[in-house]
């Protein structure tokens, strides 16, 4: 069976094809090639010698138990390599030879037992090495890795490393790789020798599922000091064992390294305490708790020097009472519990993301709402109920604002935006809206993209709502249940690029709404019941038009609308997947494609 | 179509069939089965998929006595620091996994229970399996 | 056990043509991949040429227009002609056959 051209001459996908040896029927130029769950067995020398151009090899689960001296050699060009689930049990000491750019090598499952004899010294462009979920037991750092100064990524994860020495890390006394990219997380872990990361600089320490007991983690935690961590992760997974007992006394040590950003990632334990236990992490820049949960919400008050808190898919009791001066970005998304927002004071706070909590606001949105002047970005979508009461007083700086999937009510009895003359970005798109009042985007002067699909509006009629948003490059309108517009409609839209008016319930086409919109590049009329044209003579669309969508519409093919289906065939270089586009009516000519027609009148007569 | 038994349990009776080509080999084991009353235990799971496990979700289909329910979407891994810690598993890594589940005071009719798991995941998204689960419920009190 | 041996190399100067010629032992070489791989001291090597059992050929940008391999079945020999050498070509060329091993390399050297 022959491997699945995915990119003709560059990327091939011979998965599960029962391949013995390597395929050599493919271009010399193939670039990617995923030659997985094929029973390979052994790779001798030059093994991909027919692959001169190869960047990335995928060799997962071919059964290799030998690699030979040189198996790679020629692959020059090769930036990734993945052995993944392979049971090697003869690695020659020159198997990655040849590998000259090689950035990433995934040696996951491998059994490989050391780092000490696996044969990698001498890629120095390596950016990124998985050795996950194999039998290694120490975690001495092998001299080689001095030459590896590109590292980037080390994942030791779900081995067997039980203690780290001082001596283990000597390596990374002679070449601080400032980058570096730890993950230790499910290791059986039970001593880290105090002094073993004094004076270590790494980029991301990750330890989860690591401690079997508090005290294990206690002291494991006290031995990290010393440490310099851009970002720390601590916590454990929800499919493995947990600790049976969490307090303040875990994170401690935590005060004798210097973090920049911390994240706690799923805990199985009620946090009561958030002062106590996160004492040493008042001054970290970034700080945040996914899936945990929450029992007293007003210890977020605390004067806690966090620039930026991130509170994902965790539990409360209620709404969390928030109270942070310095901090300046908030997510708070996917979290269960207090339904309602109440009131946060954030004084500096520039990012709000208050998505996906099923949150219902009864008066929205001003700056008493969130306690600062200077936010720019405010993503409120996929919650419930939320009142329009105020137009953004206060919030003037806003720049992003995004409400999609939520329902918005009272947004046809005043101008709601009207303050937001900075706003470029607006996402009403699915909000229950039923747009009823022409002044509904006043003070919009620097809108750039208007997403307002799955909507509603008056006696299904657009009228002349978007006057004032003359830099508006992007709309789209789909979903609306539109059958009409006025002929106004787009006069001001001088710099749209892209209009989407899919999914509506037109039944005739007009140019004529579109001939100030001198930029536009894309007009989607697809899903429509588009018949025929309203006028019998249909003008040009603006000369900047390149797509055209007409698909999926209730064309006429009859004699009658023989003018409006030559005007179709003469946008044909404008027009998209025109094979989509079919006769409805009449019944003989259902489902032909409108462009293959030769429609000539006689022909009906 | 080739049947494969899950449990049987004093109320509920479980078992599944692919439903996609590939049919690559999934082992499922509950223990104890499923009691549609009530309910507690561990479910295993030992698969070796054929992509990144990377943003997992589920699509579920559910059919009770041939009404069908709205589709259901389960984001099981978001893409990093997931909850779960298969979400890390790469395409050809072993998966072997016990999760421990629980539900309670829900009252379920008499009758045949269908349910379409369609595993999507990666980047691009493909589906990584399909299985139809049916479960037969015969409450055994009211 | 797979033998390979090359012959033909020696110093020329810049501008003149060399023959390589490899003969393989222990194989028949009808349905092996074959090739020729070059390796300069303090350089990265490369292969020069390679040639599929249908007969189809692979040369990289820096020899295109002056090697040319061919390879003859019935005498278990594959060929390398180098034209218009340079200086650079100046290297230890190896017979590869992609997947069972190398010769030991025949010197080549040009001169100016």
């Known amino acids: 069976e022959p491997c699945v051209e995915v990119v003709p001459n560059i990327t091939y996908q011979c998965m599960e094809l029962n391949f013995y040896k390597i395929p050599d029927n493919l271009p010399f130029s193939t670039k990617n090639l995923d030659l997985s769950f094929n029973p390979l067995r052994h790779l001798g020398s030059y093994s991909f010698f027919s692959f001169p151009e190869l960047q990335v090899l995928d060799l997962s689960r071919c059964e290799i138990q030998t690699i030979e001296d040189g198996a790679y050699q020629s692959l020059s060009h090769l930036s990734t390599l993945i052995l993944t689930g392979n049971p090697i049990q003869s690695l020659a000491l020159g198997a990655f030879s040849g590998l000259s750019s090689l950035q990433k090598l995934v040696a996951v499952e491998t059994n490989l037992a050391s780092l000490e004899n696996f044969p990698i010294g001498h890629l120095k462009t390596l950016k990124e090495l998985n050795v996950a979920h194999n039998l290694i037991q120490s975690f001495k750092l092998p001299e080689y890795f001095s030459n590896l100064t590109n590292l980037e990524h080390l994942d030791l994860s779900s081995n067997k490393i039980q203690s780290i020495y001082c001596t283990d890390l000597r390596v990374l006394h002679q070449m601080p790789l400032l980058n570096l990219s730890l993950d230790l997380s499910l290791n059986p872990m039970n001593f880290i020798q105090p002094g073993a990361f004094k004076e270590i600089r790494l980029h991301k320490l990750t330890l989860r599922n690591n401690f079997d007991s508090l005290n294990v983690m206690k002291t494991c935690i006290q031995g990290l000091a010393g440490l310099e961590v851009h970002r720390l992760v601590l916590g454990e997974f929800r499919n493995e064992g947990n600790l049976e007992k969490f307090d303040k006394s875990a994170l401690e040590g935590l005060c004798n390294l210097t973090i920049e950003e911390f994240r706690l990632a799923y805990l199985d334990y009620y946090l009561d305490d958030i002062i106590d236990l996160f004492n040493c992490l008042t001054n970290v820049s970034s700080f945040s708790l996914v899936s945990v949960t929450i029992e007293r919400v007003k210890d977020f008050s605390y004067n806690f020097g966090w620039q930026h808190l991130e509170l994902v898919n965790c539990k409360f009791g209620q709404f969390p009472t928030l109270k942070l001066k310095s901090l300046k970005r908030l997510t708070f998304t996917s979290n269960k519990g207090g339904n309602a927002f109440s009131e946060v004071d954030l004084p500096s706070l520039e990012f709000l993301d208050l998505s996906r909590n099923g949150l219902s606001f009864k008066g929205c949105c001003s700056q008493s709402d969130f306690g600062t002047t200077s936010l720019k970005y405010l993503d409120l979508s996929f919650n419930g109920v939320i009142t329009m009461s105020s137009n953004f007083l206060g919030l003037e700086q806003l720049e992003h604002l995004d409400f999609q999937h939520s329902n918005l009510k009272q947004m046809s009895e005043f101008s709601v935006f009207l303050s937001l003359r900075n706003l470029i970005y607006l996402d009403i798109s699915h909000t229950h809206t039923r747009v009823a009042f022409n002044g509904i985007f006043n003070g919009l002067s620097s809108l750039e993209v208007l997403k307002m699909a799955g909507n509603s509006f008056q006696e299904n009629f657009l009228p002349d709502i978007f006057t004032e948003l003359r830099n508006l490059t992007f709309l789209d309108l789909s979903q609306c249940q539109l059958e009409q517009l006025s002929p106004t409609a787009f006069n001001s839209l001088s710099s749209l690029q892209v209009l989407n008016m899919s999914h509506n319930n037109f039944f005739s086409l007009d140019t004529f709404p579109y001939k100030c919109l001198n930029s536009l590049q894309v007009l989607d009329y697809s899903l429509n019941h588009i018949m025929t044209s309203k006028k019998q003579e249909l003008q040009h669309f603006p000369s900047s038009l390149a797509f055209l969508n007409l698909t999926q519409n209730d064309f006429a093919c009859t004699c009658e609308h023989q003018s409006f289906l030559q005007w179709i065939k003469d946008q044909r270089q404008l027009l998209v997947e025109v094979e989509r586009m079919e006769c409805a009516t009449p019944s003989d000519k259902q489902g032909m494609p409108v462009l293959s027609l030769n429609i000539t009148c006689q022909m009906n007569k | 179509q080739k049947q494969y038994w899950v449990c049987n349990s004093s109320d509920a009776s479980i078992s599944y069939t692919y439903c996609d080509k590939m049919q690559y080999p999934i082992s499922i084991n509950v223990n104890p089965c499923i009691e549609l009353k009530r309910s507690k235990g561990l479910l295993h799971i030992f698969y070796i998929p054929r992509r990144d496990l990377k943003q997992l979700y589920f699509n579920l289909y559910i059919t009770v006595n041939t009404m069908n329910l709205p589709k259901r979407k389960e984001v099981i891994c978001r893409g990093s620091d997931d909850d779960y810690s298969f979400c890390r598993a790469l395409k050809g890594e072993t998966v072997n996994t016990t999760i421990s589940f629980s539900f309670k005071g829900i009252k379920f009719s008499k009758g045949k229970y269908k349910c379409v798991v369609e595993a999507i995941s990666g980047s691009p998204e493909e589906m990584l399996f399909c299985l139809e689960f049916v479960i037969l419920h015969q409450p055994n009190s009211n | 056990e797979v033998q390979l041996v090359e012959s033909g190399g020696g110093l020329v100067q810049a501008g003149e043509s060399l023959r390589l010629s490899c003969v393989a032992s222990g194989i028949s070489i009808s349905t092996e991949v074959m090739g020729w791989y070059r390796q300069a001291p303090g350089k990265q090597g490369e292969s020069v040429a390679i040639?599929?059992?249908?007969?189809?050929?692979y040369y990289p940008d820096s020899v295109k227009g002056r090697f040319a391999i061919s390879r003859d079945n019935a005498k278990n020999t594959v060929y390398l002609a180098m034209n218009s050498l340079k200086l650079e070509d100046t290297g230890v060329y190896y017979c590869?056959?992609?997947?069972?091993?190398r010769g030991q390399g025949t010197q080549v050297t040009v001169s100016s």
């Open positions: 040639i599929k059992t249908d007969g189809s050929t």
């Open positions: 590869i056959i992609a997947g069972r091993g």
